[in-house]
């Protein structure tokens, strides 16, 4: 029960995280105009990964896309790449984790397969979260560097008579959304990995009958192994790792990867 809860919670947390990463990637407010020097500006600038916008006091907002690929800073391209990789990995992770959920039955998928899928999706979520955190952090570092560079030469003028105020940019809402979303995806991934340990069988899964030599009541059956593999006579042998929950009749009639040692 605890394993199912951990897995389910990990899935939900990761889902929220990935939705946040997608939202952050699409948001225009990665960097916003610093209003420290002019808190009553009539023109407000903000920029995203894909376009830059200007919101005027009149209420008019104008956005222009970055229609060049080669002309963009390498750092911005790197951030874009990290965020997209994070989204793609997260999306694949979500798809895998849906099939891995213990509460969802798909055919007669074994717990070991679900455990492997849970681990895979968990790792994907962890990497996805790390990509988002890295992308946002790289952008934030770029902003901090540019902020102090523009502060150093904030005012340039002709003999000090005419001032040209350089627009400085500070952290936008998208950065915080990205950090939180990346963190959530990472936490969700860790939870999935923890859930995987609980899903995995404790001992090696031999699909064979147990032979008890202690009592005279139990006879030696040569067809026992054949029955256990699903190829021989259909004797009602129980799976030892399953606590006797299902008979071999209910198990798939083809050999699985655990049938041969």
């Amino acid at each position: 029960m605890a394993v199912t809860a951990c897995q389910g919670l990990g899935f939900v947390v990761s889902l929220i995280g990935i939705a946040g990463i997608i939202a952050a990637t699409c948001m225009d407010q990665w960097s916003t105009q610093d209003l420290y020097n002019n808190p009553v500006t009539a023109v407000f600038n903000y920029q995203g990964l894909w376009r830059s916008c200007v919101r005027e006091s009149s209420g008019f907002t104008e956005c222009r896309g970055y229609f060049t690929l080669l002309g963009l800073p390498a750092m911005l391209q790197a951030v874009r790449a990290l965020m997209i990789v994070g989204i793609v990995l997260g999306a694949i992770g979500l798809l895998v984790s849906i099939f891995a959920l213990k509460c969802i039955r798909i055919g007669s998928m074994e717990d070991s397969a679900k455990a492997n899928m849970t681990l895979t999706s968990g790792i994907m979520f962890i990497v996805s979260g790390l990509c988002a955190i890295a992308g946002v952090s790289v952008f934030a570092n770029m902003l901090v560097t540019n902020f102090w560079m523009s502060t150093a030469n904030m005012y340039t003028g002709m003999g000090g008579m005419v001032q040209t105020v350089q627009t400085r940019y500070t952290f936008g809402a998208a950065l915080f959304v990205g950090w939180v979303a990346g963190g959530l995806t990472l936490i969700g991934g860790v939870m999935m990995c923890i859930a995987c340990r609980g899903l995995a069988p404790e001992e090696t899964n031999y699909k064979a009958v147990s032979y008890h030599a202690s009592g005279h009541s139990v006879a030696y059956k040569p067809g026992g192994f054949k029955a256990s593999t699903g190829f021989g006579s259909n004797t009602k042998n129980k799976k030892i790792y399953d606590g006797g929950a299902r008979t071999e009749d209910e198990v798939q009639s083809y050999p699985s990867k655990h049938d041969y040692v």
Epitope: Q33, N38, V40, T41, A42, V43, F44, N45, Q47, S52, C53, V54, R55, E56, S57, S58, G59, F60, E62, R64, V162, Q163, T164, V165, Q166, T167
Partner: antibody, heavy 120, light 112 residues
Framework: EVMLVESGGGLVKPGGSLKLSCVAS????????MSWVRQTPEKRLEWVAT????????YYVDSVKGRFTISRDKAKNTLYLQMSSLRSEDTALYYC?????????????WGQGTSVTVSS | DIVMTQSPSSLSVSAGEKVTMSCKSS????????????LAWYQQKPGQPPKLLIY???TRESGVPDRFTGSGSGTDFTLTISSVQAEDLAVYYC?????????FGAGTKLEL
Amino acid sequence: EVMLVESGGGLVKPGGSLKLSCVASGFTFSSYTMSWVRQTPEKRLEWVATLSVVGGNTYYVDSVKGRFTISRDKAKNTLYLQMSSLRSEDTALYYCARLGQTQRNAMDYWGQGTSVTVSS
Amino acid sequence: DIVMTQSPSSLSVSAGEKVTMSCKSSQSLLNSGNQKNYLAWYQQKPGQPPKLLIYGASTRESGVPDRFTGSGSGTDFTLTISSVQAEDLAVYYCQNDYSYPLTFGAGTKLEL
């Protein structure tokens, strides 16, 4: 047709109060940023206050801060300028103006103005 | 505050003449975000409210004759009337639309 009609001006003693009104018609009043601009007897134009549609932010020229309040009644399509602690330098013709949505914050429509005289 | 300085304060012209008036701002009105200049020109005739002629330093407002041309960028701006008509006799004001307070120039009076 866009129309802005100001009213409420008059003669007032220094330290007194006055409330100017501007009734708007011919456009979606709530979607536009509105301003008050005054013209002094020397014919100088001075921006007084702005009520922006962006977050409902209000802006004032330093000389009227704390004394004047700009507000609007969307239901009545009316812009107001509440003036208190009036001084002689507040004597002017007060215009109500609309900031155009695609005019780079420029005021595309103006009212005919209402005269305010502050004198003892 | 951004100070707007207009010159000359008055200008005597003859009909058909080309007129140029200047407006200088103490700070750049060019926004780096969209590379647009936030400067407007207004025309005010006696007994009338100001009328918007030019916004964004060079864009003519609809209905404004094409003899009116705005130019300039950053801190230096110009309003040119290619061929002055009798109805153009008025006071012309430039205005900073970039930063609050939205300051106006003192005006340039165009007279015959």
